[in-house]
Interface confidence: medium
């Protein structure tokens, strides 16, 4: 024997009470599936939660963070962006390790500092959890005649002569 | 005919956490809602919260942070934890179908819960 | 949250008499209210929902009346077997709250 109520649609709720008449969802409410016996009531987005999708009778609402502000999970949760000097980890907002950094606002992940000695340069500013180091000038650079503002030549294709 | 049971560990210590399961005969947690109802003794009823057949869930503002209610519909168990437990939580725990325009049709027996050390 | 209030606590009439119970919202909730009766062992049952609408297979000597704020419970005449606590419920917004009950005794 088919159940009356599987007679009813997305949007509506089959009501027992009343010999199994389709009535519509309440007002805040809604039905994904037919032949439910109840509304799922609609999720409403407050406080620093808002509104990305509005509920109707067939979907909840679906809510996104006001700015400043992140979603954890499917968004069930809005968390402070994270500030320069930190980076998003599953557990929110971590301060950048020593010798890393992270100098944007919001996004971005902790970047290890450049080690200046690799091109033989000094280190003229210690690095923060929010700015890199500041390397001293490279050897090259201090040398006599040594232009740092020559372009480089430009690349020419092979079997190409210039016009 | 629809039933529905709740089963809990009866004593509970104090800062522990309490876990309740709702088993649900002869109705399906697709179509209808779970509400949790606890009653201190002597006391009127009060609502905990509610697991919807889509699956979201509703808690009661004051105790939110303390409860999760959650379910298996393949089991047709609905389950309510509770975290952080005192003696004020000692209480007769009710699961109730929710139907219709959210009204509570069918009622389990209760359990009773004393949180004691 | 919405507070309900229930009036009186308690209240003992005869057999046969007509018995008034009272449930006071602290905001307008509409046609939003349920009435359940709780048997001395603990059961509990639906009687009245949407304010006035029976619930299939209570007797026909519950009604119920109100909207907004106040609402009422009635039993035309009192049986036995409704010795009971009797509690109103909104369900106009969440969290879904109770009354204090109202316990009716047998004179």
């Known amino acids: 024997l088919q159940d009356p109520c599987s007679n009813c649609p997305a949007g509506t709720f089959c009501d027992n009470n009343r010999n199994q008449i389709c009535s519509p969802c309440p007002p805040n409410s809604f039905s994904s599936a037919g032949g439910q016996r109840t509304c799922d009531i609609c999720r409403q987005c407050k406080g620093v939660f808002r509104t990305r999708k509005e509920c109707s009778s067939t979907s909840n609402a679906e809510c996104d963070c006001t700015p400043g502000f992140h979603c954890l999970g499917q968004c069930t949760r809005c968390e402070k962006d994270c500030r320069p000097g930190q980076e998003l980890t599953k557990q929110g907002c971590k301060t950048c390790s020593l010798g890393t950094f992270n100098d944007q606002n919001g996004t971005g992940v902790c970047r290890p500092w450049t080690n200046c000695s690799l091109d033989g340069r000094s280190v003229l500013k210690t690095g923060t959890t929010e700015k890199d180091v500041v390397c001293g000038p490279s050897p090259a650079d201090l040398s006599p005649g040594a232009s740092s503002v020559t372009p480089p030549a430009p690349a020419r294709e092979p079997g190409h002569s210039p016009q | 005919q629809v039933q529905l049971q709740e089963s809990g560990p009866g004593l509970v210590k104090p800062s522990e956490t309490l876990s309740i399961t709702c088993t649900v005969s002869?109705?399906?947690?697709?179509?209808?809602?779970v509400h949790w109802v606890r009653q201190p003794p002597g006391k009127g009823l009060e609502g905990l919260g509610v697991?919807?057949?889509?699956?979201?869930?509703n808690y009661n503002s004051a105790l939110m942070s303390r409860l999760t209610i959650s379910k298996d519909n393949s089991k047709s168990q609905v389950s309510l934890k509770m975290s952080s437990l005192t003696a004020a939580d000692t209480a007769m725990y009710y699961c109730?179908?929710?139907?219709?325009?959210?009204?509570?049709?069918?009622w389990g027996q209760g359990t009773t819960v004393t949180v004691s050390s | 949250d919405i507070q309900m209030t229930q009036s009186p606590s308690s209240l003992s009439a005869s057999l046969g008499d007509r018995v008034t119970i009272s449930c006071s919202a602290s905001?307008?909730?509409?046609?939003?209210l349920n009435w359940y009766q709780q048997k001395p062992d603990g059961t509990v049952k639906l009687l009245i929902y949407?304010?006035?609408t029976l619930h299939s297979g209570v007797p026909s000597r519950f009604s119920g009346s109100g909207s907004g704020t106040d609402f009422t419970l009635t039993i035309s005449s009192l049986q036995p077997e409704d010795v009971a606590t009797y509690y109103c419920?909104?369900?106009?917004?969440?969290?879904?709250?109770f009354g204090g009950g109202t316990k009716l005794e047998i004179k």
């Open positions: 109730a179908r929710v139907t219709g325009t959210w009204y509570f049709d069918v």
């Open positions: 002869g109705s399906s947690l697709t179509s209808y809602g």
């Open positions: 697991i919807w057949p889509g699956g979201s869930t």
């Open positions: 905001q307008g909730i509409s046609n939003y």
């Open positions: 949407y304010t006035s």
């Open positions: 419920q909104q369900y106009s917004k969440l969290p879904w709250t």
